[in-house]
Interface confidence: medium
């Protein structure tokens, strides 16, 4: 993080009403922070959403945005017929420009785009477009959601009535009705060429306050193919001053965007203000927590036949998942530890975000192989007890897989946790390998801006002389499509071997729904050549471990050093036709509760990998060369590593296991703290012997890594 001192007061810019221009003859003006008297605000920290009400009373109102839209409660409004769009099919002029406001990236529309119908009180003119996104790999970034399902990006188009006001800003400042469209972007395997001018523009506004003219684009092409299915409700600006003047049109159909195109959003920088120090950070997770519906009604369009096929292919079963059944983000901080020679303890932490509280219990599933027979057991654990489970009678010859799922009321479930593999054996083929989540099943290369050389960490546990080791594998984007054709053996084996440097391709996440029907034995795993697993169907499902977990960015409810389970005013809250009800004593006012406040979240810090030697070809384990190097145990609870007595946590034994390249920013750190990776990959000639030692900078710092990148055939660098 770069810091520099500024001498002007911490004032704001970038809220939706403030973004107007003074450029090329335009009457409107983008107000600069230093000249403006508007309050400073942010998406996290001391100026985060919970504190917006301190400077803007409207942010505590009862008709706030964004909201979650429950389709089953939305009533069809006969007045909500086809939208009339005028000018949307024209190419934009070369005066259309984009600006990095520090809070969003905005497109200032220079042409005449009008919308009417949909119950809008008049003919509204489009003023600008803004975007909201998550932190990486298609993680949830949208502000609105449908049936609890959030999307990687939300595009918002803002309108005002030019018959009533001479400018958008006048409408805002006079607290008069404006219109807004919300369009979701969903991950797709291919680039969306309609977005090319936007993506190209993003690359020109990487830094705060940068501006660039946009190549011509067609605004209609940025909207869903079908405009007939939309929701309508009355709400607010989603940024201060949170004025409750917005007639929202939320399109149900998403627009496709590829991972590659998403990277352009994740590469945007902002400056954050703290007292008189500004820091340069990635602009990520720029969405407001969802608000309660209160006495409002959400309506849906009455356009004939527009909902029919949509309902089945998207809402009920969006891309192979049942999003409406997901009641929380996954349990986190999965850990497996040996208690003794024959027992293991699985522990985890409650999900960061609970959409439909309370959590009633947890289901622990574990599966193993012995003599080619696969067995699986599932049992439940009450949520009010220690989040630990003990597995006894562990066989040293078996490979165990563990995963945990939260169970809410009405048998609603969370996404599955990270899947942990554990093996206590003598050959130790998988010894200590931790496969760090790549989150990009489609093996698309990480962008240079986000490509931190992260190690695949390891942990060798020894109890009474018996070496234990585990492999943790992330569950991919989850909840994933069950349409993946990869066999379980190939998924497990290729992922493991790829993580050990055997693989011929990019490492895939372990898809959460490809739960083994048969697991590879240690022997078979060592013999099978690795294949890259490209679970492309997986890539399409947005919510998941990162998907809906929307990390608590502002330590909601935390003030004066205290933790509080509630968020600002009604921030972070939702309710649907059950205003007066509370889901549980503990989370009275919060339909979306954030369980991980101001703490390291989701992903553990990686630590260096264990010393498995490989043949030069990279496809075979060399037997008989297992040295008992000690590696630092992975601490799943965050960025610290406790090396134990006599161990320097920063001095570990190097190996030739390549680090897993990952685009995932570790959610354990502040998502706004960017990784500042060394952009230059290790040259292929840089090889180190197993006895080499190196320093690993604490992963919490995330600006460098001591891991050695050993080339693997076909691996993307």
């Amino acid at each position: 993080v770069l810091h520099y001192v500024v001498c002007f007061p911490a004032l704001t810019e970038g809220y939706v009403g403030a973004l107007h221009e003074n450029r090329h003859g335009s009457a409107v003006q983008i107000r600069r922070r230093k000249a403006s008297g508007d309050p400073y605000w942010a998406y996290s920290g001391a100026y985060g959403p919970e504190h917006w009400v301190t400077s803007s009373v409207s942010c505590g109102g009862r008709h706030q945005s964004p909201i979650d839209i429950l389709d089953q409660y939305a009533r069809v409004g006969e007045e909500y017929q086809e939208l009339q769009l005028d000018g949307f099919d024209n190419e934009s002029s070369n005066k259309t420009w984009m600006k990095n406001t520090g809070k969003t990236v905005a497109i200032l529309l220079k042409d005449d785009y009008f919308v009417s119908g949909a119950g809008l009180p008049g003919r509204f003119k489009a003023e600008k477009v803004e975007f909201h996104w998550g932190h990486s790999n298609g993680s949830a970034g949208s502000e609105h959601s449908i049936n609890g399902r959030r999307f990687p990006v939300e595009m918002q188009i803002f309108f005002y009535n030019p018959d009533d006001f001479d400018s958008f800003q006048t409408a805002i400042s006079e607290n008069r009705i404006i219109g807004a469209m919300a369009i979701f972007f969903q991950v797709s395997p291919r680039d969306n060429s309609a977005l090319d001018p936007i993506i190209h523009g993003l690359k020109g506004v990487v830094h705060h306050e940068k501006e660039t003219f946009l190549d011509p684009f067609v605004l209609r092409d940025l909207l869903p193919a079908s405009l007939g299915s939309y929701y309508r409700y009355t709400g607010s600006l989603t940024t201060p001053p949170c004025s409750e003047i917005v007639e929202w049109i939320v399109f149900r159909r998403p627009v496709p965007i590829s991972y590659h195109q998403l990277e352009a959003f994740y590469s945007i920088f902002t400056t954050e203000q703290q007292d008189h120090v500004k820091s340069v950070e990635y602009l990520r997770n720029n969405f407001r927590p969802q608000q309660r519906l209160h006495d409002r009604v959400v309506s849906k369009s009455a356009v004939r036949d527009s909902w029919n096929h949509d309902m089945t292919d998207f809402l009920e079963n969006p891309l192979g998942t049942e999003a409406s059944k997901v009641c929380s983000s996954p349990p986190i901080h999965m850990k497996v530890q040996p208690l003794n020679q024959t027992a293991l303890q699985v522990s985890w932490s409650q999900p960061e975000t609970i959409y439909h509280p309370p959590i009633m219990n947890y289901m622990i599933s574990y599966s193993w192989t012995k003599n080619e027979d696969e067995k699986e057991k599932t049992f439940t654990k009450d949520s009010d007890k220690d989040l630990k489970a003990t597995i006894s009678h562990v066989s040293p010859d078996s490979l165990y897989l563990f995963r945990v799922q939260a169970v809410c009321r009405n048998d609603m479930r969370s996404d599955f946790s990270q899947t942990m593999l554990f093996q206590a054996n003598t050959t130790r083929i998988f010894q200590g390998t931790r496969i760090v989540k790549t989150g990009v099943p489609t093996a698309s290369p990480a962008s240079s801006a986000d490509m931190a050389p992260i190690s695949s960490g390891s942990s060798t546990w020894t109890s009474s002389g018996i070496p234990f080791s585990f492999v943790s594998m992330a569950t991919g984007m989850g909840p994933s499509s069950s349409g993946s054709q990869a066999t379980v053996a190939s998924v497990v084996t290729s992922t493991l071997l790829a993580g050990l440097g055997f693989g011929g391709g990019g490492i895939s996440s372990f898809p959460s729904t490809v739960w083994p029907t048969r697991l590879p034995t240690a022997a078979s795993a060592s013999k099978q050549a690795a294949r890259p697993v490209l679970a492309t169907t997986e890539a399409l499902a947005s919510p998941g471990p990162d998907g809906d977990s929307s990390p608590t960015k502002d330590g909601e409810g935390t003030e004066e050093g205290e933790k509080d389970e509630k968020s600002e005013s009604e921030d972070g809250e939702r309710e649907h036709e059950e205003d007066g009800e509370k889901d549980s004593e503990k989370k009275e006012k919060s339909g979306v509760t954030h369980a991980a406040e101001e703490r390291n979240q989701t992903e553990p810090s990686p630590t260096p990998s264990s010393p498995n030697r490989t043949a030069e070809g990279g496809h075979q384990t060399i037997p008989g060369h297992e040295q008992d190097h000690t590696a630092v145990p992975t601490d799943q609870t965050g960025g610290r590593r406790d090396a134990g007595p006599g161990l320097d946590p920063d001095m570990v034994t190097s190996t030739q296991v390549p680090p897993t390249a990952t685009e995932e920013q570790y959610a354990g750190s502040d998502p706004k703290r960017p990784e500042m990776p060394s952009k230059k990959p290790m040259s292929r000639g840089d090889r180190f012997s197993e006895d080499s030692r190196f320093i690993t900078v604490n992963p919490a710092e995330k600006n460098t890594s001591g891991m050695i990148s050993r080339p693997a055939p076909g691996r993307m660098e």
């Epitope: 007061p9 004032l11 508007d38 309050p39 409207s58 004025s243 009800e581 006012k589």
Partner: antibody, heavy 113, light 110 residues
């Protein structure tokens, strides 16, 4: 951080009166400020709030009778046409929505003919 | 309009625990704050967001909320706790925003 009210005095009914809250140690552009009053022997009564953006909010009974405005370091409360019922101690407070520990000591306004 | 109801007066013996209540129709959807006011002084914030205590407030003071009732609990009441106690909350939306105080409870410590 401090707040101090001033301007309280004895006036006759119908004579406009402006109270001033002078702040130091924090920025009015980043904080909502409220006026609260307390008639002798009675409870606290919220009058109105001006937020960091300059938006104003009033109690339903106070609309038209009071006006809240601000400069860079002061927040004013104008009592447009006082009546005897407006006799009270007037407090200014910083952001009372979620609870504020910053209150001025109050200024006494007496409306009497 | 939105009304917060508090008992007019409550008595507690020295060293005992006392609970002051504040009720309203839809308080379950709102945050309550509690203020202590001694004669001739400005109010002092005791509890905000139902349960949070600002620094400097003794931990004898605690807040809770259940259903449409917010409660301020004072454990080990002391003579210095004798004062008026007000609950407050915000109501409304946008330009119709309202901040509401309860009528206050006079606490007597005997």
């Amino acid at each position: 951080q401090s707040l101090e009210e001033s301007g309280g005095r004895l006036v006759t009914p119908g004579t406009p009166l402006t109270l001033t809250c002078t702040v130091s140690g924090f920025s009015l552009s980043s904080n909502a400020m409220s006026w609260v009053r307390q008639a002798p022997g009675k409870g606290l009564e919220w009058i109105g709030t001006i937020d960091g953006y300059g938006y104003t909010y009033y109690a339903s009974w106070a609309k038209g009778r009071f006006t809240v405005s601000k400069t860079s370091t002061t927040v004013d409360l104008k009592i447009t046409s006082p009546t005897t019922e407006d006799t009270a101690t007037y407090f200014c407070a910083r952001e009372i929505y979620l609870g504020s520990n910053f209150w001025g000591p109050g200024t006494l306004v007496t409306i009497s003919s | 309009s939105f009304v917060l109801t508090q008992p007019a007066s409550v008595q507690v013996n020295l060293g005992q625990t006392v609970s002051l209540t504040c009720t309203a129709d839809t308080l379950s959807r709102r945050y309550a704050s509690w203020y202590q006011q001694k004669p001739g002084q400005a109010p002092v914030l005791l509890i905000y967001r139902d349960t949070s205590r600002p620094s400097g407030v003794p931990d004898r003071f605690s807040g809770s909320s259940s259903g449409n009732t917010a409660t301020l609990t004072i454990s080990g009441a002391q003579a210095g706790d004798e004062a008026d106690y007000y609950c407050a909350t915000a109501d409304g939306s946008g330009s119709s925003y309202q901040f509401v105080f309860g009528g206050g409870t006079q606490l007597t410590v005997t």
